[in-house]
Interface confidence: low
């Protein structure tokens, strides 16, 4: 099949970086400024993003491919691409419409970016708190108090944090 | 560019299992998450899960319970999504898209992968 | 659950037109709410998130609002190719639910 294609399709002789020109008889001409073909045998060739505004370039955009933008200091990229910049909040915040907050009572935020989450709920593992949680941090989970036995030293691993953006089930 | 490639379509008997598969390229996939949505001919579309590339974690919708399995090879930036005991209601087109670490951002999607489920 | 109720279903418009779509959730969902734009054959599309904020190359047409359980996407001047389905999504909790569709029709 691919070689009866390429009989019969000359444009599939063109190269990334070029495309297939039907205005001049189907030759390979090679992209317009801003403009790319990651491919061969395209009929165009594709606009090349542009990192404006917020967004800057961290790769120039090529014949061969797309310009590729992340976000000036300040900002954080949001979605596989960087197709968002969303402002930087301090640790024990997060982002509203009104700009950064400062988490709620019992939830904490230990990045720059994302959402208050609530503090794990160590009861539900069995266990106690063994350090308080604040606005930058989880609470740390212990043993249960049955196991605070005379001599017992070992410390339980605090329970994972729940997923980021979730109140409790 | 930023991609997400599926698997090809696939027709299943009911009571049998499909696997599909989802590639990603041009971005590291243990930055995000990987969501599936299925769509029903004609139909809305449905959540049924995601999966953390990075750990392997992943959370499913009550309805899919015991029924999926999303799983990860980060070796080759490839997920998966399993789904056992196949009756007529899972045809659909099955769409893996990516979120964020923090956000539900599902902003770029897989071309699809139809399952026709027929006896 | 929280269920997504998309309203209307179906809607009949002209280029130039106004629409508005709006989406209730059965409990607040903070702002944890995004839009969806898909086209027959096609994979959705991811408009806005965080109720008003568009991604990048989303015309200005386009644009958010609500907060709570009420939320509205408007198109202030609907194009040719506005003309799709629509799908509101709430991902304050799991499962992530999506809205019913609201299918943006040319009168």
């Known amino acids: 099949f691919e070689r009866t294609r390429s009989l019969q399709d000359p444009c599939s002789n063109c190269p990334a970086g070029t495309f297939c020109d039907n205005n001049r008889n189907q030759i390979c001409s090679p992209c317009p400024p801003n403009s790319f073909s990651s491919a061969g045998g395209q009929r165009t060739c594709d606009i090349c993003r542009q990192c404006k505004g917020v967004f800057r370039t961290r790769k120039e955009c090529s014949s061969t491919s797309n310009a590729e933008c992340d976000c000036t200091p300040g900002f954080h990229c949001l979605g596989a691409g960087c197709s968002m910049c969303e402002q930087d909040c301090k640790q024990g915040q997060e982002l509203t419409k009104k700009g950064c907050k400062d988490c709620c009572f019992g939830t904490f935020n230990d990045q720059k970016r994302g959402i208050c989450r609530p503090w794990t709920n160590c009861s539900l593992d069995g266990k106690s708190v063994l350090v308080n949680g604040t606005k930058e941090r989880d609470v740390v989970c212990g043993p249960s108090p049955a196991d605070l036995s005379p001599g017992a030293s070992s410390v339980t691993p605090p329970a994972p944090a729940r997923e980021p953006g979730h109140s409790p089930q | 560019q930023v991609q997400l490639v599926q698997s090809g379509a696939e027709v299943k008997k009911p009571g049998a299992s499909v696997k599909a598969s989802c590639k990603a390229s041009?971005?590291?996939?243990?930055?995000?998450?990987i969501h599936w949505v299925r769509q029903a001919p004609g139909q809305g579309l449905e959540w049924m899960g995601r999966?953390?590339?990075?750990?392997?974690?992943?959370e499913y919708a009550q309805k899919f319970q015991g029924r999926v399995t999303m799983t990860r090879d980060t070796s080759t930036s490839t997920v998966y999504m399993e789904l056992s005991s196949l009756r007529s209601e899972d045809t659909a087109v099955y769409y893996c898209?990516?979120?964020?670490?923090?956000?539900?951002?599902?902003?770029?999607w897989g071309q699809g992968t139809s399952v026709t489920v027929s006896s | 659950d929280i269920q997504m109720t998309q309203s209307p279903s179906s809607v009949s418009a002209s280029v130039g037109d106004r629409v508005t779509i709006t989406c209730k959730a059965s409990?607040?969902?903070?702002?944890?709410l995004s839009w969806y734009q898909q086209k027959p054959g096609k994979a959705p599309k991811l408009l806005i998130y965080?109720?008003?904020r568009k991604v990048d190359g989303v015309p200005s047409r386009f644009s958010g609002s609500g907060s709570g359980t009420d939320f509205t996407l408007t198109i202030s001047s609907l194009q040719p190719e506005d003309f799709a389905t629509y799908y509101c999504?709430?991902?304050?909790?799991?499962?992530?639910?999506f809205g019913g569709g609201t299918k943006l029709e040319i009168k």
């Open positions: 898209t990516t979120g964020n670490l923090h956000y539900a951002l599902m902003d770029y």
């Open positions: 999504l709430q991902y304050l909790d799991f499962p992530y639910t």
């Open positions: 041009g971005f590291n996939i243990q930055d995000t998450y």
């Open positions: 409990q607040p969902i903070n702002t944890y």
């Open positions: 999966i953390d590339p990075a750990s392997g974690n992943s």
């Open positions: 965080r109720v008003n």
